[in-house]
Interface confidence: medium
Amino acid sequence: FERTRSLQDPCSNCPAGTFCDNNRNQICSPCPPNSFSSAGGQRTCDICRQCKGVFRTRKECSSTSNAECDCTPGFHCLGAGCSMCEQDCKQGQELTKKGCKDCCFGTFNDQKRGICRPWTNCSLDGKSVLVNGTKERDVVCGPSPADLSPGASSVTPPAPAREPGHSPQ
């Protein structure tokens, strides 16, 4: 089938990085500057994405692949293929319609992007809280109380120096 197709359609011989030029007897012509074709047999080349404004070029466009963008300093990507950029928040915050807001008690965010997530519930796994959570960090679960038999070697967690869940200001 592929052999028959190539006999019928000379364009199928055009490799990636070229297009089948109808104006030149279906000769395979190289993609013009700032365009690409990522597959063979294409009749046109696609225009390269331009990373402008709040976007910056992560990967240059080539004759066979589109440019890839990320975001300029202070911003991060959102959406497939970094279709949008939004301003960074601090760790311990999430971006809302009213700007960056601190994570609610019982939640954390350890990145400058994304949403606040609930602390791990250690008791669901039969474990105890070894280190309290903060706005920036999840709780650390330790062995369950039953695992700590008398005389067994264990790490005694220090007494919390602040109200659990709150990060130092």
Epitope: T72, F75, D88, G99
Partner: antibody
Framework: QVQLQESGPGLVKPSETLSITCTVS????????VHWVRQPPGKGLEWLGV???????DYNPSLKSRVTISKDTSKNQVSFKLSSLTAADTAIYYC????????????WGQGTLVTVSS | DIQMTQSPSSLSASVGDRVTITCRAS??????VAWYQQKPGKAPKALIY???YRDSGVPSRFSGSGSGTDFTLTISSLQPEDFATYYC?????????FGGGTKVEIK
């Protein structure tokens, strides 16, 4: 309309800490970042740092250990502090707004001249 | 740090002249370059960002071009109010850096 206004001490002594306040109007610090840039007399521009809408900060590594930028969103104010001053820190200090379209400065304050001298 | 080298450092021109200022980055900065105009005793004013986009209210006689490492600011027909110092700035990576400036003087 968008406005930024710096207020500083004018004259500070070597080894002291410089403190400048940038008061903004016409936009919200909840949505926009604010940069600090300085310009020694008769010379070019030097980027010092930025505080983003969420309060995260980025500083020029050449000054990082000496610079602190903070803000009070409710007062529409951004604070800039530079410690361990020397005569080389004599400059006009500007605050400038970062738009939502790029990491640049679209509106600037008028600047405040700071002279470091004993 | 990315160095931004402007040339010339100064130039003399007449009203109506076409003026071109160039800026070269020490490494590839894509199109993440802005241009500013500064008049004596005043704060800088944004002209161009993303190498070629005019900021709102900037006259069409100002245009920017370039990508990678070489950038140009062109004033198609110099007006009396255009005599000033012009700076380029890269914002592809921290720290943000400016060129040394180009002073456009009256011939």
């Amino acid at each position: 309309q968008v406005q930024l206004q710096e207020s500083g001490p004018g004259l500070v002594k070597p080894s002291e800490t410089l403190s400048i306040t940038c008061t903004v109007s016409g936009f919200s610090l909840i949505s926009y970042g604010v940069h600090w840039v300085r310009q020694p007399p008769g010379k070019g521009l030097e980027w010092l740092g930025v505080i983003w809408s969420g309060g995260s900060t980025d500083y020029n590594p050449s000054l990082k250990s000496r610079v602190t930028i903070s803000k009070d969103t409710s007062k529409n104010q951004v604070s800039f502090k530079l410690s361990s001053l020397t005569a080389a820190d004599t400059a006009i200090y500007y605050c400038a707004r970062n738009p939502l379209t790029a990491t640049v400065m679209d509106y600037w304050g008028q600047g405040t001249l700071v002279t470091v001298s004993s | 740090d990315i160095q931004m080298t402007q040339s010339p450092s100064s130039l003399s021109a007449s009203v109506g002249d076409r003026v071109t200022i160039t800026c070269r980055a020490s490494q590839n900065v894509g199109t993440n370059v802005a241009w500013y105009q500064q008049k004596p005793g005043k704060a800088p004013k944004a002209l161009i960002y993303s190498a070629s986009y005019r900021d709102s209210g900037v006259p069409s006689r100002f245009s920017g071009s370039g990508s990678g490492t070489d950038f140009t600011l062109t004033i198609s027909s110099l007006q009396p109010e255009d005599f000033a110092t012009y700076y380029c700035q890269q914002y592809n990576s921290y720290p943000l850096t400016f060129g040394g400036g180009t002073k456009v003087e009256i011939k």
